[in-house]
Each structure stands twice: as structure tokens, then as C-alpha cells.
Interface confidence: low
């Protein structure tokens, strides 16, 4: 017959206690069971003890009591009691869980990244969680994006969950960058930082500043500016091929313009001094980002003397 779910001494789905207090949690069940605990509550911790005993009528039930002395804010999380796999039960594991907030006025966030941001990898169009969960469900948290944006939870695309943080159901390029969760407790402002990182391979556009055939007098300097436009956080490699490449005639300078809030603009400027006849021909700027590839070329003609 199916086992009854194990029963926890604390009822409901969540419980709030103060940091420094002792957590007592008993699990009573019809079979042997195990505890699943938040990562920071390691089973070997000196402040944690689990005692097992027989209990109930005729001592036929299984009980275990979890005691966590001087509970800390970072012990906040799910505490669950689950049956070990029981052959007679069709369900592999039956469990009961409770989320325990360990409130600390000096530490509103369970994980604090105040100096160095934690990196979160994101994919556009997918769910993104900014995991600034809190030590008390009553704390009001604001999500900000550097430098000036505030991301407002609307209950649909952006949802606040005190156990998880901010859940963004359909992440866009707007969520790329430095995101900060802020909470004010007793007049003190607390911040925890996250750096969202997305790698894309899209190349929007590649241009050479003078795409028409370039006409140049011998001895003059050739300057070709290749511009690649990409979405934010896309990285590109830009290379040139040209007639006298084997002699490394050209010097190439590169720079990135990240001032645009929607795109990165990569510049590669090719310069050849004192152009000669052997420098005439096809100049190609190649742009690669992962599997994506685009190129653009222009022809360069050399003339001995000016003509009318």
C-alpha cells in the first residue's frame, strides 16, 4: 500500500525565524527517510545534528529530529524530508518540504556579491533568474541595471519570488550587463551584483568606408576603414587580405565603440604608406564570429600621375 507522506513538525510551506536562534525540525514517517538541506547547511557542520528514533504507537514509525544551532542567514532555503526508495511504493521518493527564512537585518540577501559581481550566463528568449533571494519574505527588493535603469516586476515578464529572486521569463539584450538587486533595511542600503553574459554570433553589417573602386596616386597613403556592427556582447575577429600580404605591407589598427546602447561597432583600419603598383588589386575585410562569417571588398587602382 502507498505510504503516507512524511510529516514535518513545522506546518505550512514556509517558516520565518531569526538568525541566531536554534532551528528544531522533526520528520515523522512510515519508513526510513533522509534530509535534503540548503547547500550551506553541510551535514558535517558542527552546528547541525540529526538524531533518529523510533516513534509513534508501538514505536513503529520512523522519526528524525534536525537541530541547527545558531542558524545563519545563509542557511535560508528548502528543508525537506524524503523517504528512501521503498520497493512497495510505486513513487520512488515521497517527500515533505518547508522553506525556512532565517531573517537577519544585517544581511537581507542570502548570497551577497557586493564587491565582485557573480556571472550569470543567459540566452536571449529564455528564462533568466537574477538569484538575489532574501532572508525574509517581507523585504522589498529593487532590480536596477547599470547605469540608470530600473526593471519593474509586472507579474508577467518579470516576477519577484523571495525564494528565488527576479525571474525574467523572456530575456532580451536589455538584460545584458551589470544588474544590481537593492534592499533598504533599517535605513541601510544593501546591494548584490550580477553580471549577465551572453555570447552571440550575429554579425549585423560589415562595410568598408570606400566601397567603390579606390583611385590613388603612386606614393600616396592608402587608408581603408572596415566597420562591423554586431549585437551587444558579440565578439568578432576581423582580418584583411590584400595583394602584397606576404610582405606584410599593411599596418592594422583595431578599436571597439561600445557607446551605442544597442550594438557594438568594431573598427579595423588598414594603412599602407607609399603605395606602389604591386599594391593594386582586391582588398577584402573578413569578419568572423564563431560560425558566422561576412566579408566585404573593394578594388584599389594605382595611377602614376594625376589626370584630368
Amino acid at each position: 500500500s502507498k505510504l503516507k507522506d512524511p510529516e514535518l513538525s513545522l506546518k505550512g510551506t514556509q517558516h520565518i525565524m531569526q538568525a541566531g536562534q536554534t532551528l528544531h525540525l522533526q520528520c515523522r514517517g512510515e519508513a526510513a527517510h533522509k534530509w535534503s538541506l540548503p547547500e550551506m547547511v553541510s551535514k558535517e557542520s558542527e552546528r547541525l545534528s540529526i538524531t533518529k528514533s523510533a516513534c509513534g504507537r508501538n514505536g513503529k514509525q520512523f522519526c528524525s529530529t534536525l537541530t541547527l544551532n545558531t542558524a545563519q542567514a545563509n542557511h535560508t532555503g528548502f528543508y525537506s524530508c524524503k523517504y528512501l526508495a521503498v520497493p512497495t511504493s510505486k513513487k520512488k521518493e515521497t517527500e515533505s518540504a518547508i522553506y525556512i527564512f532565517i531573517s537577519d537585518t544585517g544581511r537581507p540577501f542570502v548570497e551577497m556579491y557586493s564587491e565582485i559581481p557573480e556571472i550569470i550566463h543567459m540566452t536571449e528568449g529564455r528564462e533568466l533568474v537574477i538569484p538575489c533571494r532574501v532572508t525574509s519574505p517581507n523585504i522589498t527588493v529593487t532590480l536596477k541595471k547599470f547605469p540608470l535603469d530600473t526593471l519593474i516586476p509586472d507579474g508577467k515578464r518579470i516576477i519577484w519570488d523571495s525564494r528565488k529572486g527576479f525571474i525574467i521569463s523572456n530575456a532580451t539584450y536589455k538584460e545584458i550587463g551589470l544588474l544590481t538587486c537593492e534592499a533598504t533595511v533599517n535605513g541601510h542600503l544593501y546591494k548584490t551584483n550580477y553580471l549577465t553574459h551572453r555570447q552571440t554570433n550575429t554579425i549585423i553589417d560589415v562595410q568598408i568606408s570606400t566601397p567603390r573602386p579606390v583611385k590613388l596616386l603612386r606614393g600616396h597613403t592608402l587608408v581603408l576603414n572596415c566597420t562591423a556592427t554586431t549585437p551587444l556582447n558579440t565578439r568578432v575577429q576581423m582580418t584583411w587580405s590584400y595583394p602584397d600580404e606576404k610582405n606584410k605591407r599593411a599596418s592594422v589598427r583595431r578599436r571597439i565603440d561600445q557607446s551605442n546602447s544597442h550594438a557594438n561597432i568594431f573598427y579595423s583600419v588598414l594603412t599602407i604608406d607609399k603605395m606602389q603598383n604591386k599594391d593594386k588589386g582586391l582588398y577584402t575585410c573578413r569578419v568572423r564570429s564563431g560560425p558566422s562569417f561576412k566579408s566585404v571588398n573593394t578594388s584599389v587602382h594605382i595611377y602614376d600621375k594625376a589626370f584630368i
Partner: antibody, heavy 125, light 108 residues
Framework: ELQLVESGGGLVQPGGSLRLSCAAS????????ASWVRQAPGKGLEWVSA????????YYAESVKGRFTIFRDNSKNTLYLQMNSLRAEDTAVYYC??????????????????WGQGTLVTVSS | SYELTQPLSVSVALRQAAKITCGGN??????AQWYQQKPGQAPVLVIY???RRPSGIPERFSGSKSGNTATLTISRAQAGDEADYYC???????????FGGGTKLTVL
Amino acid sequence: ELQLVESGGGLVQPGGSLRLSCAASGFTFSDYSASWVRQAPGKGLEWVSAISWSGDSTYYAESVKGRFTIFRDNSKNTLYLQMNSLRAEDTAVYYCAKSWATPIESLYYYGSDYWGQGTLVTVSS
Amino acid sequence: SYELTQPLSVSVALRQAAKITCGGNNIGSQTAQWYQQKPGQAPVLVIYANNRRPSGIPERFSGSKSGNTATLTISRAQAGDEADYYCQVWDASTQAIVFGGGTKLTVL
């Protein structure tokens, strides 16, 4: 499976040259900066050189500046170290290493999370 | 040039806590990394950004930083933790990666 495999090591006379290669697989090589680190027999780790994801920025230890050149070919998923004017004190196992995620390289450096098994360079007459 | 100072060796009794320090006059403004290297093997990153553990590294390993000293703590040292440990920082002023001299950890 993520792998970094160094090659090109061997015995070379003082003043000679060697080119080390590091073939990367199992990840998008062009997303990450990379380094060369060496270890002389019985000694500690010594950083040699580093290069940004695109190859635009390169960095060198004072002991190798002007003699060694780091470069990469992202189309071949390969990192290189060209070593010229080699000296006896350059004798070491040379490791290539991939940087940890560095979306804004200049702001935060998080170390190297994957290393090759190393290639031995011996400089001796 | 920038230098990081580590003790040459540290001994610890089995299942006791081991602490390895790394000192540098400007370490407070850098992010410190720690590597474990066993004989004949490549180094393994055990702590990055002062106190963060890469996936797969046991919870016994933790890092901290106070003033000009970074510390690697192995809370319940095991025989398999015997290795050389190196601290590392990025020195922004010279644009160089710097390693400490290494510490040999012996588990008694």
C-alpha cells in the same frame, strides 16, 4: 569534452627557437582569453604570457618580453607561443590555460579553469 | 615587480582545518585565485574571485581575503588534499598575472 593539448616542445640549443601550439576542443575557443604558464623542474608556477579572446591584446612577463610572442588562430582553435633567443632558464614544462568566463575582460580576472597537460621545453647545449 | 608571499609548507592532521596564506602589498584591490597541483599533473582551479568555488570542487575548500592577505582554508583535510597550492592575482598596474611561490600541504 573540453581539452587543451600542447605540442612543439623538445630539446633546443641556447639562442635557438621553438614554436609551441595548444589545440583547443570542446568549447568555443574564441570566447575566452588564454595564457601560457611554465614550471621549471622542481619549481613553482610562473606566468609567461596571456592573450585576449580576439588576439588584439597581449601581455608578457618581464622575463620573456621581446623574446616570446603569443598569438592565436581562432579559425583553427589554436593558441601559439613563438619562443626566440631561448636561454637555459627557459627550461620548463609549458602549460596552456583557458581563462574562466570574462565577459568584461578589463574589469574582472577570474583565473584559468582548464589547463593542458603541458609540453617540456629543454634548452641545453 | 609585484610579489605574492606564501609559506613554503603547511602541515595538518587528518580531518583538521588547514589554512594557507598569501600576502601581497596590494592584494586587497585584486581578485585572488587558488590552484591545487598534484605531482605530475596540471594545476586545478579550486577558488576564484577570492571566495568562489568552481563546480566540482568540494565544499571543504573555501577562500577569504582580509587586508593584504588572502587565505585558502581546507576545513576537513583529507589525504587526497596533499598537493602544492598556489595563489594568483591579476596585477592591473603592470598588466601581469602573478603567482605566489607555492605551499606544500602535508596531511599527517
